[in-house]
């Protein structure tokens, strides 16, 4: 009897990665491509339909478009190998390979997709009034994670975490956590993205910098801008007396632009 075999039918792949799933079929001597039929399906979605020596892309489900292909060179070795690139969470499930070559048979293969919170972006900023540092960690993954903040002496600290859906993919979570703390230069803090259970956690290290770059600290602004603002005040008072109201509108617009550009510069020290 014609029998398909699989050397492995449980696959795990990381989100965004590539996977090749294989079904083996018996080939004696030379493969006759025109006698071979290969179907790959996932639940109700058609992925590959290989008939009469070619793939019929018209039937391919849109979610696999440009991402799934049958590796033709492997067919001659008796392997129906489905390659999926840029794997998504929605690709997880049970795949079925059905092969007809004289006889016919099928096998089921399960694919699990995991998305660790690996690429953790971080930011450190300072509140100009309280001198308190705000530490932020953000990452995307699946399933939901909580964020644990710890200090270098292993104290667990209380942060605030928000979870939203990712813009990249519906099932992916975007987890952002902030910690407000009084800290000194070179102190080290850790944010750990932790999912339930004993599986792998992902941690980022945040080091409090010696001095946040100008103009992150408003106090630095005032030290530099103080004398300038005083001088500007005098000039403006004189100008007010000497110039017409219409000309002043231009100065105000210019100042408004200036203030806004300073605000933009204030988007803090950032590391990824």
């Amino acid at each position: 009897a014609f029998t398909i075999t699989v050397s492995k039918d449980l696959y795990v792949v990381e989100y965004g990665g590539n996977v090749t799933m294989e079904c083996k079929f018996p080939v004696e001597k030379q493969l006759n491509l025109f006698a071979l039929i290969v179907y790959w399906e996932m639940e109700d979605k058609k992925i590959i339909q290989f008939v009469n020596g070619k793939e019929d892309l018209k039937v391919q489900h849109s979610s696999y478009s440009q991402r799934a292909q049958l590796l033709k060179d492997q067919l001659f070795l008796g392997k129906a190998a489905l390659q999926i690139t840029d794997v998504r969470l929605q690709d997880a499930g049970v795949y079925c390979c059905l092969i007809g070559y004289g006889g016919a048979d099928y096998k089921r293969i399960t694919l699990k997709v995991h998305a660790p919170y690996r690429n953790i972006s971080q930011r450190i900023s300072v509140d100009p009034v309280t001198s308190e540092h705000e530490l932020m960690c953000q990452a995307e993954g699946y399933p939901e994670a909580e964020v644990i903040w710890t200090s270098s002496d292993h104290r667990v600290l209380s942060g605030k975490t928000t979870i939203t859906n990712s813009n990249r993919e519906e099932k992916l979570f975007n987890v952002t956590s902030t910690l407000n703390i009084n800290a000194t230069a070179n102190e080290i803090f850790y944010c750990t993205f932790q999912r339930s259970g004993p599986e792998e956690n992902n941690t980022a290290e945040l080091v409090i910098p010696e001095r946040l770059p100008v103009p992150a600290s408003e106090r630095t602004h005032f030290m530099i801008l103080g004398p300038f603002l005083l001088l500007l005040g005098v000039v403006l008072a004189v100008t007010f007396c000497l110039k017409k109201h219409g000309r002043m509108m231009d100065v105000e617009k210019c100042c408004t632009r200036d203030r806004n550009s300073k605000k933009r510069n204030d988007i803090q020290f950032e590391e990824t």
Epitope: D9, V12, K112, P198
Partner: antibody, heavy 118, light 107 residues
């Protein structure tokens, strides 16, 4: 903290049925759930898996037909329905959360004993 | 089905001494093998995943190795808390199967 709390174990007559429950807390059903049984003084036997959304189930051939898995995601509960029970089905039944990064069991329930005897 | 065979079935070790146990698969399973410990009266607990990958919260005394058909779990220094039955499990193919277990006792 992840917890799987099981109930429903009972003394059942041969040919009878029982439904085991497994209530999950500390996580949502974004994970596949498996069932594993252990006959008294014996090793572990994998009974199958139900996917996170319940869209697919896997049973070993020797158990197919008599046992059914289901999920109630609203109640965060997994169920195992055991039918046409035989004396050799006497065992501690464990519900287990499959890991998200592979096919190993990350968390186990405390187990519940089903005794099949007349 | 893939058959998993564990040796020895029983192992007696003094605290502080190393211990080693084996698991053999009836066909190649790459690195798709996991180790569990079941203490008396308790549920099993995963110790090592994918032949050699460590598990968060598990002491680094538990070291897994092997690939293909032959696998080993080594405990570098046995502690009193380590007694119980150790199981291997393959996750290469359905149905997932467990070994029959190795019972670790303390001398």
């Amino acid at each position: 903290e992840v917890q799987l709390v099981q109930s429903g174990g009972d003394l059942v007559k041969p040919g009878g049925s029982v439904r085991l429950s497994c209530v999950a807390s500390g996580f949502t059903f974004s994970y596949a759930m498996s069932w594993v049984r252990q006959a008294p003084g014996k090793g572990l036997q994998w009974m199958g898996t139900i996917s996170d959304g319940g869209s697919y189930t896997h049973y070993p051939d020797n158990l197919m037909g008599r046992f059914t898995f289901s999920l109630d995601t609203a109640k965060n509960t997994a169920y195992l329905q055991l039918n046409s029970l035989r004396a050799e089905d006497t065992a501690v039944y464990y519900c287990a959360r499959e890991s998200y990064d592979g096919y190993y069991v990350a968390n186990w329930g405390q187990g519940t004993l089903v005794t099949v005897s007349s | 089905d893939i058959v998993m065979t564990q040796t020895p079935l029983s192992l007696s070790v003094s605290p502080g001494e190393p211990a080693s146990m084996s698991c053999r698969a009836s066909q190649s399973i790459s690195n798709n093998l996991h180790w569990y410990r079941q203490k008396p009266g308790q549920s099993p607990q995963v110790l090592v995943k994918y032949a050699s990958q460590s598990i968060s919260g598990v002491p680094d005394r538990f070291i897994g190795s092997g690939s293909g058909t032959d696998f080993t779990l080594r405990i570098s220094r046995v502690e009193a808390d380590d007694l119980g039955v150790y199981y291997c499990q393959q996750s290469n193919s359905w149905p997932q199967t467990f070994g029959q277990g190795t019972k670790l006792e303390l001398k």
